[in-house]
């Protein structure tokens, strides 16, 4: 057989965060190279990562065309060298990936607190809207643009001097919370898609940001902006 020197890929795994989507597989090639194909259920197969010796393939460009579609990929194994020397004339071995629907399955990236602003006993906390590689009319869309009201943020906040956490939720990127006068607070946010029922419904928590730190004092009489 012409493909005795090539083995089919295995452990095909989708790794996707904020729609940046990479297919990974094994094994590391010794005497073979790989070519990946991707397709929607109703579409044609499109070749990507042609004759690659890598064991990953960035498929972002394909899946962002329609993030609500369901995609299937497959990885072909070709002998590493021209095929005449291996006598290969049969179809190369390949392995199918699990199905992948970006809108439902991409992981939510770690959010970032863009700024907080205190006025008296109110604090406005703004979450940075992450850009994705999803496009509409040649413009890149933000996470909020893509998910709309399906995406909410949860704010965890607490007094610097205590450990008792409070929470707030918003379906925009801003929170307006009540705080005690003269107290410094710390904040962390988490992105959530409540409609998901899987492990990927929540992001990891953002880095903690606290009032009264070196990057800007919080004053009861003024405004404080904290930027990254």
């Amino acid at each position: 057989s012409g493909t005795t020197n090539t083995v089919a890929a295995y452990n095909l795994t989708w790794k996707s965060t904020n729609f940046k989507t990479i297919l990974e597989w094994e094994p590391k090639p010794i005497n073979q190279v790989y070519t990946v194909q991707i397709s929607t259920k109703s579409g044609d197969w499109k070749s990507k990562c042609f004759y690659t010796a890598d064991t990953e393939c960035d498929l972002t460009d394909e899946i962002v065309k329609d993030v609500k579609q369901t995609y299937l990929a497959r990885v072909f194994s070709y002998p590493a060298g021209h095929v005449e020397s291996t006598g290969s004339t049969e179809e190369p071995p390949y392995e199918n990936s699990p199905e992948f629907t970006p809108y439902l399955e991409t992981n939510l990236g770690q959010p970032t607190i863009q700024s907080f602003e205190q006025v008296g006993t109110k604090v406005n906390v703004t979450v940075q809207d992450e850009w994705t590689l999803v496009r509409r009319n040649d413009t890149f869309l933000s996470l909020r643009d893509v998910f709309g009201k399906d995406l909410i943020y949860t704010l965890y906040y607490w007094k610097s001097s205590s450990s008792g956490k409070k929470t707030a939720k918003t379906n925009t990127n801003e929170f307006l919370i009540d705080v005690d006068k003269g107290e410094n607070y710390c904040f962390s946010v988490q992105a959530v898609i409540p409609s998901r029922r899987t492990a990927n419904r929540k992001s990891t928590d953002s880095p903690v940001e606290c009032m009264g730190h070196e990057k800007g004092e919080s004053r009861e009489t003024g405004h404080h902006h904290h930027h990254h």
Epitope: T35, Y78, G81, H82, V83, E84, T89, E91
Partner: antibody, heavy 119, light 113 residues
């Protein structure tokens, strides 16, 4: 001996289509990946498309993606390039070339066929 | 995409003298697992298709005279014609076959001085 003979070139208006053929002989065609490479008049070489020996996988230069389709008929020892929505910048000599010692190393080339896109 | 840049654009050398052509890739074409440079050199004479001279940066294709040699690794490569002959007048192209899309250098025209 190995021979690659292109045909199908000619003068065509912008927006129209053309299909190039490459007849292969002197080797086991079904065992080799095949490529199209083009050369605009007085210019350098530009890779256009590749098809694997089995015909399953195809890959294109960004400049022709969605307009050109590479295919092969192993029973006829023939490689094809279907060129749609042709543009003036597609004017070139089109060569078919065979994978050599490794994928993308061309050990044999055809003599080329000239495609002129002009109104 | 890997961009291949050749220099000089043209070169005039006396018969029997050495001709040296450089090729630089925008990223490494050396594959670490087999320590091979995925680079080839072609010769193209007027009115003819290109002819493969060298692959893996330094391996001569069968039938190519030994006055042609290739060297270099990573991103910098050289094609040397040790003693230029009249029949060597041509345009020379480097090409990377490390990753798709495959890309060629712009070519170097070699003439007799």
């Amino acid at each position: 001996q190995v021979q690659l003979v292109e045909s199908g070139g000619g003068v065509v208006q912008p927006g129209r289509s053309l299909r190039l053929s490459c007849a292969a002989s002197g080797f086991t065609f079904r065992s080799y990946g095949m490529h199209w490479v083009r050369q605009a008049p007085g210019k350098g070489l530009e890779w256009v498309a590749v098809i694997t020996y089995d015909g399953i996988n195809k890959y294109y230069a960004d400049s022709v993606e969605g307009r050109f389709t590479i295919s092969r008929d192993n029973s006829k020892n023939t490689l094809y390039l279907q060129m749609n929505s042709l543009r003036a910048e597609d004017t070139a000599v089109y060569y078919c070339a065979r994978d050599g010692v490794y994928y993308g190393v061309y050990d044999y080339w055809g003599q080329g066929t000239l495609v002129t896109v002009s109104s | 995409d890997i961009v291949m840049t050749q220099s000089p654009d043209s070169l005039a050398v006396s018969l029997g003298e050495r001709a040296t052509i450089n090729c630089k890739s925008s990223q490494s074409v050396l594959f670490s697992s087999n320590n091979k440079n995925y680079l080839a050199w072609y010769q193209q004479k007027p009115g003819q298709p290109p002819k493969l001279l060298i692959y893996w940066a330094s391996t001569r294709e069968s039938g190519v005279p030994d006055r042609f040699s290739g060297s270099g690794s990573g991103t910098d490569f050289t094609l040397t014609i040790s003693s230029l002959q009249a029949e060597d007048v041509a345009v020379y192209y480097c090409q990377q076959f490390h990753s798709y899309p495959l890309t060629f250098g712009g070519g170097t025209k070699v003439e007799i001085k």
